[in-house]
C-alpha cells in the first residue's frame, strides 16, 4: 500500500523558519504534489505549494521555496513573519497524486517538545486518504 510521510522541522539557526519534508512510498509515478496547512486539501486546508515533476513548482506566502528533493520527495521552506510562531501549532498536509494509485495524503506537525533543528518522525498522521 502506498504511504505518504511528513516531517516538520524548525531551523536551528532561525526560529522563525520551518521546513516541511514529504515523501511518497509507493510504486507509482507522481503526477502532482500539493502542500496545505490547517488541514487536508479540500477539507479546510489552505494550499501553500503545488509541485509538478515536469511543469515546475509554485509556492505562495508564507511559503518561501518549494523544491523536489528526489523523484518521490519534496521540501517546502516557510518563513514566519509574525512575532509569535503560528507554525509551531499548525498541521501541514502533503497530498501526492500518482498513477495508477490515485491520491494519498498525510499530515504532520512540529512535535510540542521539539528543539530547534529536530524534526518530527517520518510517521504519517492517520489522515491517510485515497481518493
Amino acid at each position: 500500500t502506498p504511504e505518504v510521510w511528513v516531517q516538520v522541522q524548525m531551523e536551528a539557526t532561525e526560529l522563525s523558519s520551518f521546513t516541511v519534508h514529504c515523501g511518497f512510498l509507493g510504486p507509482g509515478s507522481i503526477s502532482l504534489v500539493t502542500v496545505s496547512w490547517g488541514g487536508p486539501d479540500g477539507a479546510g486546508g489552505t494550499k501553500l505549494a503545488v509541485l509538478h515533476p515536469e511543469l515546475g513548482t509554485r509556492q505562495w506566502a508564507p511559503a518561501r521555496q518549494a523544491r523536489w528533493e528526489t523523484q518521490s520527495s519534496i521540501s517546502l521552506a516557510l518563513e514566519d513573519s509574525g512575532a509569535s510562531s503560528p507554525f509551531a501549532n499548525t498541521t501541514f498536509c502533503c497530498k501526492f497524486a500518482s498513477f495508477p494509485e490515485g491520491s494519498w495524503e498525510s499530515c504532520g506537525s512540529l512535535p510540542p517538545s521539539s528543539d530547534p533543528g529536530l524534526s518530527a518522525p517520518p510517521t504519517p498522521v492517520p489522515i491517510l486518504r485515497a481518493d
Epitope: T34, E54, L55, G56, R58, W60, T70, Q71, A97
Partner: antibody, heavy 114, light 113 residues
C-alpha cells in the same frame, strides 16, 4: 475541460485605472490558480504574476509590482487584475492562464490613449 | 531574472520540410532533485492565445502531434518539427518554468513558403 473567459476590450485615458476579469469554469487539479501575462506589440510575452485562490496570496514579477494588483473571488471562480497609473506602455493584450499555462483565456486588449 | 534567447527570430520553410529552432537560458533549468528540466514551448497562431506544446523540455502536451519534438537539457534546448504542415504557421516561444519570474523567449516566427 477548463475554460477561461476574459472581460472585453478596454480603452482608457492615461493616468486612469482598469480592472480585467477572468472567469474559470470546468475542473482542474490545481483549482483556479491563475497567471497573468502581458503581450506587447503582438510578440513579447511577460509574466506578471499569479494568485492563489485559497488565501489570495500573490506572486509578482518585480517589474509589475505597484502596477498590477491580483485578486480572486473563489466563490465565483473569477480572478481579477487591476492596473493603475496607466500609460501608453501599458497598451497590450493581457491573458490569464491556469497555473501551469496549459489553458489560456482569449485575451483582453487594453488601449491607453488620450 | 533568467534571460531566454531564441534563434532564429524567423524562418521560412516549405511544407514537408524539417525545421529546428533553438532556445538558450542564462541559467540552468535543470532541477537537481528530480533531474527534470523546467522548460516549456508554446505555439501562438495569429489572433489566438499561446498554446502549450511541450513541457519538461521534452514531454508533449496531450493532443500535440508527434511531429513536434522537444530536446535539450540545462541551458540549451531545441524544438523540432519533423515535417512542417501549413497549419504550423505561428510564433513559437520557449519559457523558463524553473524560477520566478517565469520569463519567455522573444519567439521564433515560422513562415510557410
Amino acid at each position: 475541460e477548463v475554460q477561461l473567459q476574459q472581460s472585453g476590450p478596454e480603452v482608457v485615458k492615461p493616468g486612469a485605472s482598469v480592472k480585467i476579469s477572468c472567469k474559470a469554469s470546468g475542473n482542474t487539479l490545481t483549482d483556479y490558480f491563475i497567471n497573468w501575462v502581458k503581450q506587447s506589440h503582438g510578440k513579447n510575452l511577460e509574466w506578471i504574476g499569479d494568485i492563489n485562490p485559497d488565501n489570495g496570496a500573490g506572486n509578482y514579477n518585480q517589474k509589475f509590482k505597484g502596477k498590477a494588483t491580483l485578486t480572486v473571488d473563489k466563490s465565483s471562480g473569477t480572478a481579477f487584475m487591476g492596473l493603475r497609473s496607466l500609460t501608453s506602455e501599458d497598451s497590450a493584450v493581457y491573458y490569464c492562464a491556469t497555473l501551469y499555462f496549459d489553458y489560456w483565456g482569449q485575451g483582453t486588449t487594453l488601449t491607453v490613449s488620450s | 531574472d533568467i534571460v531566454m534567447t531564441q534563434s532564429p527570430s524567423s524562418l521560412s520553410v516549405s511544407t514537408g520540410e524539417k525545421v529546428t529552432m533553438s532556445c538558450r537560458s542564462s541559467q540552468s533549468l535543470l532541477n537537481s532533485g528530480n533531474q527534470k528540466n523546467y522548460l516549456a514551448w508554446y505555439q501562438q497562431k495569429p489572433g489566438q492565445p499561446p498554446k502549450l506544446l511541450i513541457y519538461g523540455a521534452s514531454t508533449r502536451e496531450s493532443g500535440v502531434p508527434d511531429r513536434f519534438t522537444g530536446s535539450g537539457s540545462g541551458t540549451d534546448f531545441t524544438l523540432t518539427i519533423s515535417s512542417v504542415q501549413a497549419e504550423d504557421l505561428a510564433i513559437y516561444y520557449c519559457q523558463n518554468a524553473h524560477t520566478s519570474p517565469y520569463t519567455f523567449g522573444g519567439g521564433t516566427r515560422l513562415e510557410i513558403k
